[in-house]
């Protein structure tokens, strides 16, 4: 049973219609209204990801027997990263806890490939999703989530790590992308913009949404995050776009109401456990999937991204609270904490539903260039 929330059936970009149609071009602003990021110059010439940070740079996943009993992931794979080139960022470098990725920030020096060579890899995230070009894969079954409805106790740690707000999740949250593709949730965090400026990481036909939630998971084939980094399918992220709706989202309010307590970079608080699945869209059957990377250093590849077709609705006040409460380093607001979209470089985005079939009058012949390659493997 989920906490009540807005727009359970709103499609991507579909406003508050409540209809569950796949996203159509007519729902999106024109390209002039929301310019797409340019690809980072010379990216193809940069070194690959052979030199991933060693395991000493990465936090371990604590076993349940250790104090707090929660998976520790505070400073790594938080799947975050730098904004549009035309929107220079003023904020957010890492917590000062001594790992090799501790000095990156959004929209400025040092260049990320210098922080972690993997950031120059060919299969990076986030990406622009073009539903018309997505490969429909009937083998992509509805996601399965187990144990996501957490009781109020034990409490969870909510932290401002200087580049996002992150909720550390306890053991026991299991997620399956399909048979034999099982994961456990580690943490969730958000990406957002600023007043009047959207801040999702992924885009759809160039359209950027107000915000985006990421729930980061570790494959059950691995005991620790550092073992999984860079391994195909080692990590999986569930991503959902957050949009403005007419009512307050009570699930998100349980987190947003606590942001003032962690306004300062590096601060943290404890929040009662909540229904984590209530932070996600209700339709687990319609999504896009592709293989990419963490969206912040170390930018490790092999991450399976699942981006929901349905959006989650928050009130205007809630979106404002998200983008206007937290502070990053150097007395700067923590805003616009998203990375520019990265080139697909031949990757095919798969869809669990026929996203390329558009009912719009403007789309007489759906373009379905790609075929499903390996869904469900």
């Amino acid at each position: 049973q989920r906490l009540p929330r807005m727009q359970e059936d709103s499609p991507l970009g579909g406003g508050s219609s409540g209809e569950d149609d796949p996203l159509g071009e007519e729902d999106l602003p024109s390209e002039e209204d929301s310019p797409r990021e340019e690809d980072p110059p010379g990216e193809e010439d940069l070194p690959g990801e052979e030199d991933l940070p060693g395991e000493e740079d990465l936090p371990e996943v604590k076993p349940k027997s250790e104090e707090e009993g929660s998976l520790k992931l505070e400073d790594l794979p938080t799947v975050e990263a730098p904004g549009d080139p035309q929107e220079p960022q003023n904020n957010a470098h890492r917590d000062k806890e001594g790992d090799d990725q501790s000095h990156w920030r959004y929209g400025g020096d040092p260049p990320w490939p210098r922080v972690s060579p993997a950031c120059a890899g060919r299969f990076q995230s986030p990406v622009d999703i073009r539903p018309q070009l997505a490969a429909f894969c009937p083998a992509l079954r509805p996601l399965e989530l187990l144990g996501f409805q957490l009781p109020p106790l034990p409490e969870l740690r909510l932290r401002n790590n200087g580049h996002s707000v992150q909720l550390t999740l306890p053991p026991g949250l299991e997620m399956a992308l399909g048979p034999g593709r099982e994961y456990r949730a580690l943490q969730l965090h958000l990406h957002w913009g600023a007043a009047g400026r959207p801040g999702s990481e992924h885009t759809v036909e160039g359209h950027r949404f107000p915000a985006e939630i990421h729930v980061v998971h570790l494959s059950t084939a691995f005991a620790r995050v550092d073992e999984a980094l860079g391994r195909p399918g080692g990590l999986a992220v569930l991503a959902a776009f957050l949009e403005e709706g007419p009512e307050e989202n009570s699930a998100y309010e349980q987190l947003l109401s606590r942001l003032e307590e962690i306004a300062e970079e590096g601060s943290e608080t404890q929040v009662p456990g909540l229904d984590i699945s209530a932070l996600l869209p209700s339709d687990f059957s319609r999504y896009f999937q592709y293989e990419g990377s963490l969206t912040t250093p170390p930018c490790a590849q092999g991450v399976i991204w699942t981006v929901f077709n349905q959006t989650v609705m928050l009130s205007a006040k809630q979106l404002h609270t998200l983008s206007d409460t937290l502070w990053g380093p150097g007395d700067s607001r923590l805003q616009l904490n998203f990375r520019a979209t990265q080139p697909l470089n031949g990757r095919v985005i798969e869809a669990s539903f026929p996203a390329g079939v558009d009912s719009s009058p403007r789309a007489a012949e759906p373009v379905q260039l790609n075929s499903c390659l390996a869904a469900g493997d």
């Epitope: 707090e68 009781p151 109020p152 409490e155 009570s250 404890q270 009662p272 229904d275």
Partner: antibody
């Protein structure tokens, strides 16, 4: 026998201060989150504040009506809970109960042990 | 804050009657609801936790049910010593909130 005994209530003028104490016995005090709940004359129950246990860093939480004026604290060595009340208002007049909350082995916020209460009267 | 609405605010019943009190919550709280009994001049006592679990030492005539936003508290056979005010309380998130109370009297 599990027991909570409050003390420190009394009559105080608006703007004044008072410190309530609660002595706990019969259970492992250090394991538990501890709360203050109050009840204005003829009214219902209102949660005021709680303080977490040692394992959770002793961090406090307050209701909006008392935040910035009241401070909850504890001394595990004395099995004692405290509520320092400053800038008291007439609407703070109530019976204040010391209450035991959850612990590491529970998964739910409920109040299973209550003290007998101590009366705080704020009046000019 | 989560709002709790109890009904009725007062009720009168006879010994042996089945008595039911309801608690409506402003948002989904799963099963994180407790019921308390408070007799005049005394501290409240926990009766039911997690919507339906009977606290240690509480007579079996007391029961609770419900989940989400609507909860019910029942006394299967009212006894004279049950005269009290009953409160529901949510434990989903803080600030923890109580219902306004239901005063139970004997006819």
């Amino acid at each position: 026998e599990v027991q909570l005994v409050e003390s420190g209530g009394g009559l105080v003028q608006p703007g004044g201060s008072l410190r309530l104490s609660c002595a706990a016995s019969g259970f492992t005090f250090t394991d538990y989150y501890m709360h203050w709940v109050r009840q204005a004359p003829g009214k219902g129950l209102e949660w005021v504040a709680f303080i977490r246990n040692k394992a959770s860093g002793y961090t406090p939480q307050y209701s909006a009506s008392v935040k910035g004026r009241f401070t909850i604290s504890r001394d595990d060595s004395k099995n004692s809970l405290y509520l320092q009340m400053n800038s008291l208002k007439i609407e703070d007049t109530a019976v204040y109960y010391c209450v035991r909350g959850g612990h590491a082995g529970s998964n739910y916020w409920y109040f299973d042990v209550w003290g007998q209460g101590t009366t705080v009267t704020v009046s000019s | 804050d989560i709002q709790m609405t109890q009904s009725p605010s007062s009720l009168s019943a006879s010994v042996g009657d089945r008595v039911t009190i309801t608690c409506h919550v402003s948002q989904n709280i799963n099963v994180w609801l407790s019921w308390y009994q408070q007799k005049p001049g005394k501290a409240p006592k926990l009766l039911i936790y997690q919507a339906s679990n009977l606290h240690t030492g509480v007579p079996s005539r007391f029961s609770g049910s419900g989940s989400g936003t609507d909860f019910t508290f029942t006394i299967s056979s009212l006894q004279p010593e049950d005269i009290a005010t009953y409160y529901c309380q949510q434990g989903q998130s803080y600030p923890f909130t109580f219902g306004q109370g239901t005063k139970l009297e004997i006819k």
